[in-house]
């Protein structure tokens, strides 16, 4: 808390300008009017105030707006945003994408802080859903943003927003998240032709069911091994050797290097050895010839 002291003669600030940068804490407190500060917030960001000085300016705004800052002030906070706590931000009502962008720009280079997470949460809740422009903005600043959301939160993403998603935005998504995103992507890209569709859907295939993988295998897509290794194990297991061969195309040779890793390992265990041998890759571990495979899960379902 800054002690209340009278402003020295001639030091009263008539505007927010560079003459304030060497004001001491108590001088800023005494000589800068909070209402003046609020109307000239855009100037604060052009002046290299120290952290100590920013603390004083924040204190003045807090006194002026105890219920939370208006958006006209929030939009121009600049580096002062770094001084805000999640509790401060929960009092705000941020509706403009421009305001969001301005504050994310200030935080650029930082990890997603609790302040930023709170700001985004307030903004998205206010909008009711993650629309394309918002998602575009958020993933531009934080490529991992999408994967930080819970499956429940992802369910509010409209399919139209999926067009904003880049492959790197999905790098840290787990299967539960891709399970939610894949159907949205399928819907979003449904009017594209085969090869273009595959390019767009590829990053989302970690959420694809068996029947969609079977359909892709009929389209000469030549899936790379990195994508194949991210597929759901339960979706890969029912695929036949012929289907996997068609799905991977020339990349099928890469299965040998991955034969000890899921889902390839588990898939091999489900295939007949003589079918695996047709690939000529030396894959071992399939079901020996003459053995009968009983699918107990299917039996249980029938009974």
């Amino acid at each position: 808390e800054v002690e209340k002291t009278a402003c020295p003669s001639g030091k009263k600030a008539r505007e927010i300008d560079e003459s304030l940068i060497f004001y001491k804490k108590w001088e800023l407190e005494a000589c800068v009017d909070a209402a003046l500060l609020a109307t000239q917030m855009d100037r604060v960001n052009a002046i290299p105030f120290t952290y100590e000085q920013l603390d004083v300016l924040k204190h003045k705004l807090d006194e002026l707006y105890p219920q939370g800052y208006p958006e006209s002030v929030i939009q121009h906070l600049g580096y002062l945003f770094l001084k805000m706590s999640p509790e401060d931000i929960r009092k705000w009502n941020v509706t403009s994408l421009e305001t969001l962008k301005a504050l994310l720009e200030v935080n650029k280079g930082h990890e997603m802080s609790p302040q930023v997470a709170t700001l985004i949460d307030r903004f998205v809740k206010g909008r009711g859903q993650l629309d394309k422009d918002t998602l575009d903005t958020l993933t531009a600043f934080y490529p991992g943003y999408l994967c930080s959301l819970s499956p429940e939160e992802l369910s509010s993403v409209p399919p139209s927003s999926i067009w904003a998603v880049r492959p790197q935005d999905l790098d840290t998504c787990d299967p539960r998240q891709l399970d939610v995103l894949y159907p949205k992507a399928r819907l979003a890209f449904q009017n594209m032709n085969g090869s273009e569709y595959f390019v767009k859907i590829q990053s989302f295939l970690g959420g694809a069911p068996t029947e969609d993988l079977k359909a892709l295998s009929q389209q000469n897509v030549s899936m790379d091994l990195a994508t194949f290794m991210k597929l759901r194990t339960d979706a890969v297991l029912p695929l036949t050797v012929a289907e996997v061969q068609k799905l991977l195309g020339p990349h099928v040779e890469g299965l040998k290097a991955e034969e000890r890793h899921r889902p390839v390992r588990d898939w091999i265990l489900r295939q007949r050895q003589d079918d695996l041998d047709t690939l000529g890759l030396g894959l071992q571990g399939g079901i020996p010839n003459g053995y009968l495979v009983l699918d107990l899960s299917m039996q249980e379902a029938l009974s």
């Epitope: 560079e18 060497f22 290299p48 120290t50 952290y51 930082h110």
Partner: antibody, heavy 118, light 106 residues
């Protein structure tokens, strides 16, 4: 890309004067606060002087106050340091640096050596 | 505000994990930057706000700390990392630097 090039350094006798210049390019010079920072041989860094973007607000370290004058010409993208009444302890490499909004020194020149000796 | 760096010098080998500390004479929040200076060259900004990596700086450099105690860590020292490192506070004017830590080849 951003470039800061200092000039004007050299050998001067105690009590003498020198004028350092810093030519800036690759960024909007008039938007930036600029600093002079010096480094005595084998020693650390000392913030010597600071000038606001318009040139109206200036700072000097106590060690140079009254002897050094910082100025800028935004039309010429240039920063200056007029050094008078030089002392042996002013011997150093002098760097000009752009000062970010966070008060860090973002871009530096290569430095110019000032030697004060009789 | 005075900044005290320790150690003033250290010897290390390529691949070593190196830690340099900077202590402020009073609390400075996270208003601390780290610079690298190679012989005959100007300093280069590595880290600002105590832990944020400047654009283009390798991820083996990291910063931590808040208040009075700060650390610069190089996770796996590379040949080009042998240099002198300085901390700088920007919590209040005048802006000040630490005395430097020289990282030499063992």
């Amino acid at each position: 890309q951003v470039q800061l090039v200092e000039s004007g350094g050299g050998l001067v006798k105690p009590g003498g004067s020198l004028r350092l210049s810093c030519a800036a390019s690759g960024f909007t010079f008039s938007d930036y606060y600029m600093s002079w920072i010096r480094q005595a041989p084998g020693k650390g860094l000392e913030w010597v002087s600071y000038i606001s973007s318009s040139g109206s607000t200036i700072y000097y370290a106590d060690s140079v106050k009254g002897r050094f004058t910082i100025s800028r010409d935004n039309a010429k993208n240039s920063l200056y340091l007029q050094m008078n009444s030089l002392r042996a302890e002013d011997t150093a490499v002098y760097y000009c640096a752009s000062t970010s909004r966070r008060c860090t020194f973002q871009h530096w020149g290569q430095g110019t050596l000032v030697t004060v000796s009789s | 505000i005075q900044l005290t760096q320790s150690p003033s010098s250290l010897s290390a080998s390529v691949g070593d994990r190196v830690t340099i500390t900077c202590r402020a004479s009073q609390g400075i929040s996270s208003a601390l930057a780290w610079y690298q200076q190679k012989p005959g060259k100007a300093p280069k900004l590595l880290i600002y706000d105590a832990s944020s990596l400047e654009s283009g700086v390798p991820s083996r450099f990291s910063g931590s700390g808040s208040g009075t105690d700060f650390t610069l860590t190089i996770s796996s020292l590379q040949p080009e990392d042998f240099a002198t490192y300085y901390c700088q506070q920007f919590n209040s004017y005048p802006l000040t630097f630490g005395g430097g830590t020289k990282v030499e080849i063992k």
